[in-house]
Interface confidence: medium
C-alpha cells in the first residue's frame, strides 16, 4: 500500500487483510488542510509502512487493540 510523505494525503491505496500480529504501531491522521480524509498508517514489524482502510470494521478493531495494548504497557 503506497505511502507518500509530503503535506498531502499520504495514502494512495489501502491494504486488505492486514493482520494485527504484524503491526508494530499505528498512526491515525485526522482530516485537515493537508488531506480531507482520515488516514490510518500502520508501521509493520519489518519497518515498512502500510495504509489501512479506516472504514473497515477489521481495521477499527486493530486500532482499538493496538491502542489498548499501548495503554496497558
Amino acid at each position: 500500500a503506497s505511502v507518500v510523505t509530503e503535506l498531502r494525503c499520504q495514502c494512495l491505496q489501502t491494504l486488505q487483510g492486514i493482520h494485527l500480529k504484524n503491526i508494530q504501531s499505528v498512526n491515525v491522521r485526522s482530516p485537515g488542510p493537508h488531506c480531507a480524509q482520515t488516514e490510518v498508517i500502520a508501521t509493520l514489524k519489518n519497518g515498512k509502512k502500510a495504509c489501512l482502510n479506516p472504514a473497515s470494521p477489521m481495521v477499527q478493531k486493530i486500532i482499538e487493540k493496538i491502542l489498548n495494548k499501548g495503554s496497558t504497557n
Partner: antibody, heavy 119, light 107 residues
Framework: QVQLQQSGAELVRPGSSVKISCKAS????????MNWVKQRPGQGLEWIGQ????????NYNGKFKGKGTLTADKSSSTAYMQLNSLTSEDSAVYFC????????????WGQGTSVTVSS | DIQMTQSPSSLSASLGGKVTITCKAS??????IAWFQHKPGKGPRLVIH???ILQPGIPSRFSGVGSGRDYSFSIRNLEPEDIATYYC?????????FGGGTKLEIK
C-alpha cells in the same frame, strides 16, 4: 524469484533428534515470518510454529512445544527446525512456508522434507 | 484453539462442472481464512487469502466467500489440473489451524 529449498529426506532412530533446514532466496529473509507445517502420511496439514528471523521472535502450537525448536540464521538466509525425542508419531513430511509481511497468508512453500523414524 | 471443520472430505465432479467446499470455524475468524491447493510431492499452493482475494496467477474460476464462522470455496469450469486436495486455514488467532482437507477427483 522467491524460493524455499528444504534439506533432504531423513531416516532416524527413535529417541534421537533431527534438524531440518529451509534455505530462502529471492527476498529479504529477515522481514518475513517463516512457518513450519507437518503432514503425516495420509493425513492433513498441522501448523507447528513460526519464527521471525529479524529478531528471533517465535510462536509455537502448544501441541508441539518441547518437540520442535525453531531457529534462523540471517547470514545464510536459512531457517531450521530441530525435532527432539523422536517417535513414530513424528514420521511425516515437514514443510517450511513464508508468511507475507502484512496479512500472514503463507504465499511460498518449500518442497517438503520427509522424516522417517524407524529402528 | 480454533477448530476448522471442512466438508466434504472428498468429492467427485465432472470436467467443466462446479464444486463447493465449506469450512466452519469454532468461532468468528473475521474473514481471516486462506485456501490452499495441495498436490502429492509438492508444497501447498496459496489460492485465496482473506476469504476472497485471489492470489496472482490463480484463474478467476476459483472464488471464496464467507464471514463470521462460515466460509466456502468454489471452483467452476473444472479442469484436469484442479485435481488436488484443498485445505482451508484460519489465521485470525494463533495457533493457525487447518481444516481436514477435501480430496477432489474428476469423474
Amino acid at each position: 524469484q522467491v524460493q524455499l529449498q528444504q534439506s533432504g529426506a531423513e531416516l532416524v532412530r527413535p529417541g534421537s533428534s533431527v534438524k531440518i533446514s529451509c534455505k530462502a532466496s529471492g527476498y529479504a529473509f529477515s522481514d518475513y515470518w517463516m512457518n513450519w507445517v507437518k503432514q503425516r502420511p495420509g493425513q492433513g496439514l498441522e501448523w507447528i510454529g513460526q519464527i521471525y528471523p529479524g529478531d528471533g521472535d517465535t510462536n509455537y502450537n502448544g501441541k508441539f512445544k518441547g518437540k520442535g525448536t525453531l531457529t534462523a540464521d540471517k547470514s545464510s538466509s536459512t531457517a531450521y527446525m530441530q525435532l527432539n525425542s523422536l517417535t513414530s508419531e513424528d514420521s511425516a513430511v515437514y514443510f517450511c512456508a513464508r508468511e507475507r509481511d502484512y496479512d500472514v497468508a503463507m504465499d511460498y512453500w518449500g518442497q517438503g522434507t520427509s522424516v522417517t523414524v524407524s529402528s | 484453539d480454533i477448530q476448522m471443520t471442512q466438508s466434504p472430505s472428498s468429492l467427485s465432479a465432472s470436467l467443466g462442472g462446479k464444486v463447493t467446499i465449506t469450512c466452519k470455524a469454532s468461532q468468528d475468524i473475521n474473514k481471516y481464512i486462506a485456501w490452499f491447493q495441495h498436490k502429492p510431492g509438492k508444497g501447498p499452493r496459496l489460492v485465496i487469502h482473506y476469504t476472497s482475494i485471489l492470489q496472482p496467477g490463480i484463474p478467476s474460476r476459483f472464488s471464496g466467500v464467507g464471514s463470521g464462522r462460515d466460509y466456502s470455496f468454489s471452483i467452476r469450469n473444472l479442469e484436469p489440473e484442479d485435481i488436488a486436495t484443498y485445505y482451508c486455514l484460519q489465521y485470525d488467532n494463533l495457533p493457525w489451524t487447518f481444516g481436514g482437507g477435501t480430496k477432489l477427483e474428476i469423474k
